[in-house]
Interface confidence: medium
């Protein structure tokens, strides 16, 4: 199936009848919470760094004859080294995260030769997307965060072809579809309404959607499942 | 002299202070950038291998094929006999899966299905051979001695293999090596 079969429209029903998913809904509070949490982390970190700067400035600007200049220079030198290490870490870690080297020497050789950088190593490619196929089990919220930290998003399914492919390789995994309660519509983590069939939707405790051997089904968001992440190339 | 020393240390302190401030600013920017990336679906920034990226075909697989490590795999959802599977793979300029090691299909380790692979018994060599003529490593399937020579081999990504009549219809995996 070509990818045009499902798009997200901005007006009323899909602009034409084969195109299914709807515009973002007003009620996307769950994902907004997630975004708020992320923003909170960001602001907190910035605040920490600002506080640090502020404290340093006040100390530096005070004339403290009782403290030997050598000591001040030494402290500043140590702070500089710590900051430099932090900068290096932040610059280096993301690339090492996305390029975990395989221990086997044969694989390392061939992987270096053919890894084009379309996707991080150990991820798979399929139809212009990269997928991280997780082995560990997490709750839906933990999975969402784990994927966000991998610079990607929790598995989204764009068409039936992709769903069939994913069920073939991994039939039980979280997807980026949830609802606030059984009285609310299903939405994607981007806030788009999700109209594809989700089995067991009438269970009020099942508010997160998972990929299942025969399509999508709802489950408890707190239960632990394997998770996959995806980003589009 | 003491005044000079004091001035020197103050100069060193001042320089270090400026370096600290600039490093702090850099750190602030880096932190902001790395956390801005935590949006729900950020644009993915490819790795540093720019030279290889220029040649976009160097490791792209055909649509509907899976790229993993240095190979492309076609994982069928329909079932065919072993021979039909082999012909299909050949028509796609690939061959039925030849396993390099037991964790080659790691990415689909939770799949329940069995798939035809490119292993068949050669009467001439009295051995199980891959399509390219290489012999089966005994470490790959410890149970291979129980395989019936007239049968073909279906493999499960959990590492299990079973021999079945070649006329049985199974899913299949084609493989293309990129390099």
């Amino acid at each position: 199936m070509d990818n045009q079969g499902v798009i997200y429209s901005d007006l009323n029903l899909p602009p034409n009848p084969k195109r299914k998913q709807q515009k973002p809904k007003g009620n996307t509070s769950s994902i907004l919470v997630t975004e708020q949490e992320i923003t909170y982390v960001e602001l907190n970190l910035q605040k920490t760094s600002q506080d640090f700067q502020g404290n340093y400035k006040t100390n530096h600007c005070k004339d403290l004859p009782s403290v030997p200049e050598k000591l001040i220079a030494g402290i500043l030198g140590i702070i500089c080294l710590i900051l430099m290490a932090s900068v290096v870490t932040i610059v280096v870690i993301p690339s090492t995260l996305t390029q975990k080297h395989n221990n086997s020497s044969l694989n390392t050789r061939t992987q270096k030769a053919c890894h084009c950088g379309h996707c991080p190593e150990e991820w798979i490619t399929y139809s212009n997307s990269c997928y991280y196929i997780g082995k560990e089990k997490r709750t839906w919220a933990e999975s969402l965060l784990a994927c966000t930290l991998k610079n990607s998003s929790l598995l989204s399914i764009d068409n039936e072809e992709e769903m069939k492919f994913l069920t073939a390789i991994s039939p039980s995994t979280w997807t980026g579809v949830f609802r606030d309660s059984s009285q609310h519509p299903w939405v994607t983590i981007n806030g788009l309404t999700f109209k594809h069939e989700i089995k067991d939707s009438d269970n009020a405790e099942h508010n997160c959607a998972m990929l299942h051997a025969r399509g999508l089904k709802s489950d408890r968001c707190g239960s632990s499942k394997i998770y996959h992440c995806k980003h589009k190339l | 002299m003491a005044v000079f020393k004091t001035t020197l240390w103050r100069l060193i302190s001042g320089t270090l202070g400026i370096i600290c401030l600039s490093l702090m600013a850099t750190l602030g920017i880096l932190l902001k950038n790395s956390f801005t990336k935590l949006s729900v679906e950020p644009a993915y920034t490819p790795g540093p291998n720019i030279e290889l990226q220029k040649d976009s075909d160097c490791c792209s697989c055909h649509e509907k094929w899976v790229g993993y490590r240095c190979n492309c795999y076609f994982i069928s959802s329909e079932e065919k006999t072993w021979n039909e599977s082999r012909h299909f793979c050949a028509s796609q300029k690939s061959s039925l899966l030849q396993l390099q090691n037991r964790d080659e299909l790691d990415f689909m380790s939770s799949s329940q299905h069995f798939y035809w692979i490119g292993l068949s018994y050669s009467e001439e060599h009295t051995a199980w051979l891959w399509e390219n003529g290489s012999a089966l490593s005994q470490y790959l399937f410890p149970s291979f001695e129980t395989f019936k020579p007239k049968n073909c081999i279906a493999y499960n990504s959990k590492g299990n293999a079973l021999d079945e009549s070649c006329e049985t219809k199974n899913r299949y995996i084609c493989k293309q090596q990129l390099i």
């Epitope: 009323n12 084969k18 069939e197 009438d202 | -």
Partner: antibody
């Protein structure tokens, strides 16, 4: 189990209106689209229109614009079509159908309501 | 509106026979076509969607093909329970439009 329950029959006078219901069980109508289809006796199928119950957005075939009004009540998990200014031409079976996701346009059908317009 | 021309309007066939029904759209519908079966007094039942995909639970003797404007439904070996009326539907554009139907009867 997914089901769409419709009333069996309605007898109405010419010029009057009728409101047909389609009650869903086994799923929440907010999570799908509901379409309405008309079938006159011994004739083919005609698409009337559909609704997204999550927001009330509707689409109609030009022929049924002004004739049919599609609504939904999510609290009772029911979709409706109201037919106005009825004539003998409106005598037909009216089916509701549910979209099945991806490219399956009508995955589930109601059993149909026969509307007879007669003096 | 897209017009769907279905043929034949009715046909007689024997059990075990291969049967083909065709549908022609007045413009390219990008394979957004479904086939339905309807038996007397019953609701329609979806057999095929997206021109060639079989709905779960539908026997494999039914198959669909086609692209652009021309589509067909084939029953490889006719069985008694296959008697009924068959409709095609285009869902490439609103309004959705059905073919007039093909009545399939036993010879």
């Amino acid at each position: 189990e997914v089901q769409l329950q419709q009333s069996v029959a309605e007898l109405v006078r010419p010029g009057a209106s009728v409101k047909l219901s389609c009650t869903a069980s086994g799923f929440n109508i907010k999570n799908t689209y509901i379409d309405w289809v008309k079938q006159r006796p011994e004739q083919g199928l005609e698409w009337i229109g559909n609704i997204d119950p999550a927001n009330g957005n509707t689409k109609y075939a030009p022929k049924f614009q002004g004739k049919a009004t599609i609504t939904a009540d999510t609290s009772s998990n029911t979709a409706y079509v109201q037919l106005s200014s009825l004539t003998s031409e409106d005598t037909a079976i009216y089916y509701c159908a549910r979209w099945g996701g991806w490219d399956v346009r009508f995955a589930y059908w109601g059993q149909g309501t026969l509307v007879t317009v007669s003096a | 509106d897209i017009k769907m021309t279905q043929s034949p309007s009715s046909m007689y066939a024997s059990l075990g026979e291969r049967v083909t029904i065709t549908c022609k759209a007045s413009q390219d519908i990008n394979t957004y076509l479904s086939w339905f079966q309807q038996k007397p007094g019953k609701s329609p039942k979806t057999l095929i969607y997206r021109a060639n995909r079989l709905v779960d639970g539908v026997p494999s003797r039914f198959s669909g093909s086609g692209s652009g404007q021309n589509y067909s439904l084939t029953i490889s070996s006719l069985e008694y329970e296959d008697m009924g009326i068959y409709y095609c539907l285009q869902y490439d554009e609103f309004p959705l439009t059905f073919g007039a139907g093909t009545k399939l009867e036993l010879k």
